[in-house]
Amino acid sequence: HSFGPGPGLGTPRSPCNARGPCRLFFRVCLKPGVSQEATESLCALGAALSTSVPVYTEHPGESAAALPLPDGLVRVPFRDAWPGTFSLVIETWREQLGEHAGGPAWNLLARVVGRRRLAAGGPWARDVQRTGTWELHFSYRARCEPPAVGAACARLCRSRSAPSRCGPGLRPCTPFPDECEAPSVCRPGCSPEHGYCEEPDECRCLEGWTGPLCTVPVSTSSCLNSRVPGPASTGCLLPGPGPCDGNPCANGGSCSETSGSFECACPRGFYGLRCEVSGVTCADGPCFNGGLCVGGEDPDSAYVCHCPPGFQGSNCEKRVDRCSLQPCQNGGLCLDLGHALRCRCRAGFAGPRCEHDLDDCAGRACANGGTCVEGGGSRRCSCALGFGGRDCRERADPCASRPCAHGGRCYAHFSGLVCACAPGYMGVRCEFAVRPDGADAVPAAPRGLRQADPQRFLAGVIAVIVVVVIAIVAGIVVLVISRKKRMAKYEKAEIKEMGEMHRELNA
């Protein structure tokens, strides 16, 4: 295990920059391995900082190939079950000691990031990573803290006072709620929170706790800032001061607690564990996710990251959930592809943000004095006399449909039509027969269908009804087809878009 200049890189580089003695720290960060961008999330699985670091003093002419490393292990308590696939981020930090303005200076020397697959309980895995001119040799493994066991560190239950369907004092097993824990009779008084037993009358302590009944906190815990590890599924408990107490973030950074450690959200131009570093140059590539680094031409000038769409944070390290702003209107489904935002629109809506309603009259103009009518999930134009077509743009011959009954003659007029009725008929459409005996006019039955033949008359009425129904159905079909044609172009575009989305989401 070593950290130093890689082979074949010429004169070995000192980590101390010829500015007196320095110390190296390692920050280990675990992130869920399911994300495409390993840098987009906080250290959700856990983070830790190496301790007991020896001081390295540069001597003229001395090789920097083997630098003194922190003693022992860097332990990272993790939350919940072990995921198996994860992203491992190891940052090598230099703390410059000695007399200069501002006290100790921190600089990021190297950052290695890699996605790993590792079962808990397995042997140490060895790795070598190069970044820039530095080379880091390290080993890593995942180990369950009792009572968690197995490749995923699933928790075996212990006797806890929690109501359950199981027997007295027993609780359902996580993550198997249908099973109950096996009762184990620990030493009387053994802490139910910090102790456990695998054999009767014993009291084994979780890390960070000691004493015969596991009630005494250990002063040096694997959790940072005196935080105490809890069971494997709960990370670190909070009996002592929290990691953010006193705000360890410098230069206006804001502190957030993660897995018993802390993370600083740094203001523009600052970087590092505590936002204390502005000595990273743009050539070091401090901006994640392709962000543009501005300024930072030398270690003494601050840099600023200009983030790509969908990312934010002082180093573009956080993915923005742009869908939380609900940009898709009218119930559209939002998909954030990172580099682009897509809206999948509900039927009847279209546009980049589903802002166009295909079924309303808002964007629909009926020409020549026609009026738009909504209904039945569609819209149509009710045209003024003398006009027809979908948008009332076509000139219509009002007499084309032969509206005058019983041989009446139709005359087109600027405001519509006029029927000149044949002798014996009257009405706007010549629909009434005039009785010769001076009785009231009655609707005329078609010739051949007189009262003397009621069956034929009834059949005629039914035929007329059928024709009317067919006409209505035909009208609806025409409306549906025209609407489908209108939506087809949007759907084609959406299908292509969804194909692109599928490719992008799988990339």
């Epitope: 840098t39 950052r111 590539g285 543009l292």
Partner: antibody, heavy 117, light 107 residues
Framework: EVQLVESGGGLVKPGGSLRLSCAAS????????MNWVRQAPGKGLEWVGQ??????????HYAESVKGRFTISREDSKNTVYLQMNSLKTEDTAVYYC????????WGQGTTVTVSS | NIVLTQSPATLSLSPGERATLSCKAS??????VSWFQQKPGQSPRLLIY???NRYTGIPARFSGSGSGTDFTLTISSLEPEDFAVYYC?????????FGGGTKVEIK
């Protein structure tokens, strides 16, 4: 000083192959997304493709015009990114630049690829 | 893909004059627009990012403005070294696309 140096350009027949290299110095190469951008003679700039970091499983993205024919790879240990060009067409004739990041901040000097029979 | 249209194609001006270059996007790109300068035989150089921010080392005579679909690059007083081709590029939507360029030539 940041330097990106492209190489591997030349004359090739339609249907042929060529591999371009871009060697970086002065930057922590493994922390940078890398792109290829081309410029046909007398024409504007066209993005060709991109490769991201090891932490992103070296994810690649390509322009529709080259998808299936061009492949981008990188070797962080050598600070080098490559563009493998197969089934070349006359319309692929251009100066090819490598450039960094999402916003194309650092650029190389370019290498000329001529596809002609 | 988003289409960027630059105008004019050529701008003939004298040193000391003010140059105004236009770039129109086919759809809203927010402020994710950059401007690049390219001199004959050289590679492009980033001038402006985020529509209005000068990149490191770029002189103050270069300024950018605009948002949405209309963007402008202004060179307040042309220097002899400013005569070149200028490209706008959008970085709002993947893939990034460029305009056809505006050539600023000496009158």
């Amino acid at each position: 000083e940041v330097q990106l140096v492209e190489s591997g350009g030349g004359l090739v027949k339609p249907g042929g192959s060529l591999r371009l290299s871009c060697a970086a110095s002065g930057i922590t190469f493994s922390n940078f997304w890398m792109n290829w951008v081309r410029q046909a003679p007398g024409k504007g700039l066209e993005w060709v493709g991109q490769i991201r970091l090891k932490s992103d499983d070296y994810a690649t993205h390509y322009a529709e015009s080259v998808k299936g024919r061009f492949t981008i790879s990188r070797e962080d240990s050598k600070n080098t990114v490559y563009l493998q060009m197969n089934s070349l067409k006359t319309e692929d004739t251009a100066v090819y630049y490598c450039t960094t990041g999402y916003y194309f901040d650092y650029w190389g000097q370019g290498t000329t690829v001529t596809v002609s029979s | 893909n988003i289409v960027l249209t630059q105008s004019p194609a050529t701008l003939s001006l004298s040193p000391g004059e003010r140059a105004t270059l236009s770039c129109k996007a086919s759809e809203n790109v927010g402020t994710y627009v950059s401007w690049f300068q390219q001199k004959p035989g050289q590679s492009p150089r980033l001038l402006i990012y985020g529509a209005s921010n000068r990149y490191t080392g770029i002189p103050a005579r270069f300024s950018g403005s605009g948002s949405g679909t209309d963007f402008t690059l202004t060179i307040s007083s042309l220097e002899p070294e400013d005569f070149a081709v200028y490209y706008c590029g959008q970085f709002y939507s993947f893939p990034s696309t460029f305009g056809g360029g505006t050539k600023v030539e000496i009158k």
